[in-house]
Structures are given as structure tokens and as C-alpha cells.
């Protein structure tokens, strides 16, 4: 037999299919020009010493073969003895290691069998009613196709599906969408209505993320507040990456999960903007304010579940940094200014109340005064910090108040509101004899003592009603008792106590009269 012809003799090997798992498969035959044809196939298994034979049976029942040697592609003309206008059955027999392996048969009319391409170029992926929709442009001059898909997950083998007939310049396919795992899809096409026509090769992989992006499993830590009033937010654990099917490993466009950081500054609610979304590429600096931080995962189908953390406010206080002067017109605060043209946010809330009850005021951008101080004033009528109770005050600063990540904490401290000097007056002053010339004076703690750092000291005043001599005794703010000694028996005294703050002298308590009785010896 001539090599260019189909040989109508018995092939040069025994006719017995070994039934092994390896062997020839995916036989495709089609016309490649007006008078030439091509068949190609895949061979699975070791290729050393393998000889391939393309077998052909005509409708008359006569059969022939082409010897392809080690090649897996073979061309022949319409003069090779194979009927091209009538239906023929073709298959491949591979002779290897003294056994024959056979491919599945294809039955087709060669003249009408056109080589179909898989979807080429960009395959657009979208979600439609809980399913996956793939769309692509039909390859040139190939309108009218049957389309199949196959898909797999990282843990499952290929599953075959049908896209149905296509008859347009664009083709599409509805496929199953997995909720929580990535999938790899491939598509193939063949001529529509041409009985037995060959399938195209499989397309390049289309990698599809799960419908729900994975929930980010990350942990944050926040550093100590620095001298500049800012603290670095750091990511302790990077988000886990999605497990991908085999063909999607490496660069898999389409399956990417994007993680973003949503920052919500809870403190200073009167500022212009409370939230900002950032890329995880760089962790921001935060002020000492309270924040909620969420990591949002999203993929091409949209956002998934997020994970939220609360970062509590830094409560480190600096009792000396804030000067407060109370005048007839109102109250003014002074603190060391940060820089030129700074906006300050002054926030206050009654101690022991829910953080949601904070009130704040935003200053206009201000430069330091000649003493290098920044100020904030309010009138009594405004009602700000007007109640006689302890307030926690925090001052934040920013040169760009609309930028959430550029606020810094200037100071945090406590302040007793309203008429602190009167409200702080100690009550329940009592005097007890201590010895022949001394007494013990006790009093109930001043309301100011509920406000950390506000009460500077108590002062106890003792007045000799005879000589009108007055002595004053400073007492530590943590003490509510003092011993007065060097007193004379039979003399009337009055004692008073007041509570002082760093900026305000307290009001004396009601005078308490006492005397040490003269001891008469028997």
C-alpha cells in the first residue's frame, strides 16, 4: 500500500483491544481545504515505541488503515480511497508493547466536517439568577455550534455539561455556580447539525471564584499611642488565599479576592467624615479614638461577609496638659498647639455613661497664640459641660479634618463641669477628740474626687475664735481625714474644709464649731 492511501488490507498487528486505561482518545477529523483532510488525536500514556494507525470503515463495510507511525496527526486527500461525501466511521488503533489500544469511534461525513475552534479570546463571566453566565464572541465563520463545558473544583474531577445549540455572533452558556469553592471551566464547540462532527479542542481555562468570597480570617493589633498622638494599626495575620483548581494555579485572573479595610472613627462624631476604605497594602495610623475596623472581602461577583473588630479608645490621660479658666462670660480651655492651621475636635462625655453620649465641637482652623497655645471657649448658655459632674475630655487635631487617617490625639483628661468650686465642697465634716490637745477632722470625699486628676488637694482651715488666729493645713486628695494638734482646752474653734483643683480654689464648707473640754483632776 502507498503511504498516501488508505490501505484496504489487514493491519500489521493482531486485532485485540487491550482495554487499558491509556491509549488514543479525542479523535477529530475535518476538511482543511477543498480537497484535503486532517485527523488528529491525543495519546495518553508512555509514547516510546508506540505506532498509530488511523482506521476507516466505509458504509459498504470495507475497512482500511493509514499508518501514522509515532505522529498523532495525519493528512490525506480526497483521492486516498476514503469516501468523503458519504458517512464513514473512523478510529485510531495504537500498537504498543505487544498490545492494541483503540480510541472511541467517530462517524461523520468528511466533506461537511469543518474544523471548529473553541471559544477564543475573552470569555466574559457574570452572575445571573444564582447561575454562572459565560459569553464570548463566535469564532470567525463558525456561526452555528453545539457547545459543551466541563468544570472541576480543587477537590472534584471534571464534570461534563451542555450549553445547548448556538446560532449567533455571540455565544453563551449557563453553568452551575459554587457557593464556597473556586471552579475551573473549559468550553468546546462543534458544528451544529453535522452528524458526528468532531469537537474542537478545549478552551483555555476560565477560572471562576465562589459566589461568596471567603470570610477574611485576620487579626489586628494596635501599637501604643506615640508622642505625636497616633498609633499604628498592624495586621497580625494576612487573609488566607483561596484554594484553586489545578488549571487555575499560578496566575488565575477571575478568582482574585480583594480585601479592603473599612475604618470607622467612632469618637468625635461632629467631624465631616466618619468612614474611609483603604487597601490592605498599607496599614494606617490612628488617633487614640475608638474605631470599628472591618475587613471586607470581595470578588468579581461583589462583596462577601466582613469581619469587624472594635478598637477601644486609648484612655491614657494627661492631667496637666489642659488649662481651664472659668470666667463670668464662660469657660476657656488652653492646651499646647500642634501646628499652624490645625482643626481641633473637643469631645466630652459624662464619666460612667455610654460612649454613645459623647458631645463634641469642631474648631475652625487655628494657629497657635503667642504663647504657643490653642484655645476653645464656650459660654454658660451653651450648656456645654454645664452639669456639675465629671466629664472625660479628649482633644483631637488634624490639618485635614475631612481625612479620617490624619487625626491625632492631643490630650485626654478629666474636667468637673458646672460650678465645680461649689459642687466640690466637702460635706459631713465631723470633729472627734483625739488627745488632750488635738482633734481628728473627717469629711466625706468631695464630688471632685470622682474625677481623676481634678482634685489637687483639700485644705483644712482652723480658726481660734478667741485670738482670731487662722491656720490652714493642706491634705492629699486621697485623704479625707487630718489631725489638728497644738490646740488649747476650753478655747472655741471653727473648722472648715475646701477642695481645690489645679485651676480653681474651692468653696469652704460650713464652719464646724468645737472645743476641747478642760480636764478637771480629781
Amino acid at each position: 500500500c502507498r503511504t498516501s492511501e488508505c490501505c484496504f488490507q489487514d493491519p500489521p498487528y493482531p486485532d485485540a483491544d487491550s482495554g487499558s486505561a491509556s491509549g488514543p482518545r479525542d479523535l477529530r477529523c475535518y476538511r482543511i481545504s477543498s480537497d484535503r483532510y486532517e485527523c488528529s488525536w491525543q495519546y495518553e500514556g508512555p509514547t516510546a515505541g508506540v505506532s498509530h494507525f488511523l482506521r476507516c470503515c466505509l458504509s459498504s463495510g470495507r475497512c482500511c488503515y493509514f499508518a501514522a507511525g509515532s505522529a498523532t496527526r495525519l493528512q490525506f486527500s480526497d483521492q486516498a480511497g476514503v469516501s468523503v461525501l458519504y458517512t464513514v466511521t473512523l478510529w485510531v488503533e495504537s500498537w504498543a508493547r505487544n498490545q492494541t489500544e483503540k480510541s472511541p469511534e467517530v462517524t461523520l461525513q468528511l466533506y461537511n466536517s469543518v474544523k471548529y475552534e473553541p471559544p477564543l479570546g475573552d470569555i466574559k463571566v457574570s452572575k445571573l439568577a444564582g447561575q454562572l453566565r459565560m459569553e464570548w464572541e463566535t469564532p470567525d465563520n463558525q456561526v452555528g455550534a453545539e457547545v459543551q463545558f466541563r468544570h472541576r473544583t480543587p477537590s472534584s474531577p471534571w464534570k461534563l455539561g451542555d450549553c445547548g445549540p448556538q446560532d449567533d455572533d455571540t455565544e453563551s452558556c449557563l453553568c452551575p455556580l459554587e457557593m464556597n469553592v473556586a471552579q475551573e471551566f473549559q468550553l468546546r464547540r462543534r458544528q451544529l447539525g453535522s452528524q458526528g462532527s468532531s469537537w474542537s479542542k478545549w478552551s483555555s481555562p476560565v477560572c471562576v471564584p465562589p459566589e461568596n468570597p471567603p470570610q477574611p480570617q485576620v487579626r489586628f493589633s494596635v501599637e501604643q499611642l506615640g508622642q505625636d498622638g497616633r498609633r499604628r494599626l498592624t495586621l497580625k495575620e494576612q487573609p488566607t488565599q483561596l484554594e484553586l483548581p489545578e488549571g487555575c494555579q499560578g496566575l488565575a485572573p477571575g478568582t482574585e479576592v480583594t480585601y479592603r479595610l473599612q475604618l470607622h472613627m467612632l469618637s468625635c462624631p461632629c467631624k465631616a467624615k466618619a468612614t474611609r476604605t483603604l487597601h490592605l497594602g498599607k496599614m494606617p495610623y490612628l488617633s487614640g479614638a475608638a474605631y470599628n475596623v472591618a475587613v471586607i472581602s470581595s470578588n468579581q461577583f461583589g462583596p462577601g461577609l466582613n469581619q469587624t473588630w472594635h478598637i477601644p479608645a486609648d484612655t491614657h490621660t494627661e492631667p496637666v496638659a489642659l488649662n481651664i479658666s472659668v470666667g463670668t462670660n464662660g469657660t476657656t480651655m488652653y492646651w499646647p498647639a500642634r501646628a499652624q492651621s490645625m482643626t481641633y475636635c473637643i469631645e466630652w462625655q459624662p464619666v460612667g455613661q455610654d460612649g454613645g453620649l459623647a458631645t463634641c465641637s469642631l474648631t475652625a482652623p487655628q494657629d497657635p497664640d503667642p504663647a504657643g497655645m490653642a484655645t476653645y471657649s464656650w459660654s454658660r448658655e451653651s450648656g456645654a459641660m454645664g452639669q456639675e459632674k465629671c466629664y472625660y475630655i479628649t482633644i483631637f487635631a488634624s490639618a485635614h479634618p475631612e481625612k479620617l487617617t490624619l487625626w491625632s490625639t492631643v490630650l485626654s483628661t478629666y474636667h468637673f463641669g458646672g460650678n465645680a468650686s461649689a459642687a466640690g465642697t466637702p460635706h459631713h465634716v465631723s470633729v472627734k477628740n483625739h488627745s488632750l490637745d488635738s482633734v481628728s477632722v473627717d469629711w466625706a470625699p468631695s464630688l471632685l474626687s470622682t474625677c481623676p486628676g481634678v482634685l489637687k488637694e483639700y485644705v483644712v482651715r482652723c480658726r481660734d475664735e478667741d485670738s482670731k488666729q487662722v491656720s490652714e493645713h493642706p491634705v492629699q486628695p486621697t485623704e479625707t481625714q487630718v489631725t489638728l494638734s497644738g490646740l488649747r482646752a476650753g478655747v472655741a474653734y471653727t473648722v472648715q474644709v475646701r477642695a481645690d483643683t489645679a485651676w480653681l480654689r474651692g468653696v469652704w464648707s460650713q464652719p464646724q464649731r468645737f472645743s476641747i473640754e478642760v480636764q478637771v483632776s480629781d
Epitope: 476604605t277 483603604l278 497594602g281 495610623y285 490624619l406
Partner: nanobody, 124 residues
């Protein structure tokens, strides 16, 4: 007054390269700024392509340009560059430079300062 001036756009064949520059005046890159490149194709929303932090050089790239585009900054010249390799027709857009005072890399487009934009056209 802050000004951002882009240059380096043009027409290029698919697979080719371009280098965009963004020269900033009125701000100093030694401060905390996010500087980056956004693009807008006809009929599409503006999207962030690549960002860099002026303070520590941290970067962000959109998935569509990873491995092809590289962002760098020269703080001495107050200039940011975007090296674009293996360009594709879908990279065709007006590319804008933007800067924002911030200590992170914001993913929104609420940036304070914007350039006029430079056209990049990739032909197939």
C-alpha cells in the same frame, strides 16, 4: 496651590510599553500622601490602577494590571511614575494622577488633588 501634571501618554501597539509621569507641586512627598493612578475608559467608571505611599513606598495594584504595571516615586523630584508593560487594548483610557493626604492607601476615589489626565490608546 497644588498641581499635578501627567505626561507620557500616547498611542502604542498591543504588547508595547509606556511610562507615565506625574509631577507634583505645592505638596511635599516627605509628608504622608497616597499618590496614584486612576483611569477612565469611555462609558466606564473611574478605577484605581496603582497607588504608592510617599512615606514608606507601600504599593497597591489592581488585579487587572498586576505583573504588568510598576509604580515608583522619586521623592526628591516630587514625581511618581507608572511603567506600563505588555499593554492590552483594554488598557485604553484617560489616566489621571491623584494625591491624597492620608496615612493609608484609600481605595475610594475621594482624593483631594487631581491632574488633568493623559490619554493612553492601545491598538490591536
Amino acid at each position: 496651590e497644588v498641581q499635578l501634571v501627567e505626561s507620557g501618554g500616547g498611542l502604542v501597539q498591543a504588547g508595547g510599553s509606556l511610562r507615565l509621569s506625574c509631577a507634583a507641586s505645592g505638596i511635599t512627598f516627605d509628608d504622608d500622601y497616597a499618590i496614584g493612578w486612576f483611569r477612565q475608559a469611555p462609558g466606564k467608571e473611574r478605577e484605581g490602577v496603582s497607588l504608592i505611599s510617599s512615606s514608606d513606598g507601600s504599593t497597591y495594584y489592581a488585579d487587572s494590571v498586576k505583573g504588568r504595571f510598576t509604580i515608583t516615586s522619586d521623592n526628591a523630584k516630587n514625581t511618581v511614575y507608572l511603567q506600563m508593560n505588555s499593554l492590552k487594548p483594554e488598557d485604553t483610557a484617560v489616566y489621571y494622577c491623584a494625591a491624597d493626604p492620608t496615612s493609608g492607601l484609600p481605595s475610594d476615589d475621594e482624593y483631594d488633588y487631581w491632574g488633568q489626565g493623559t490619554q493612553v490608546t492601545v491598538s490591536s
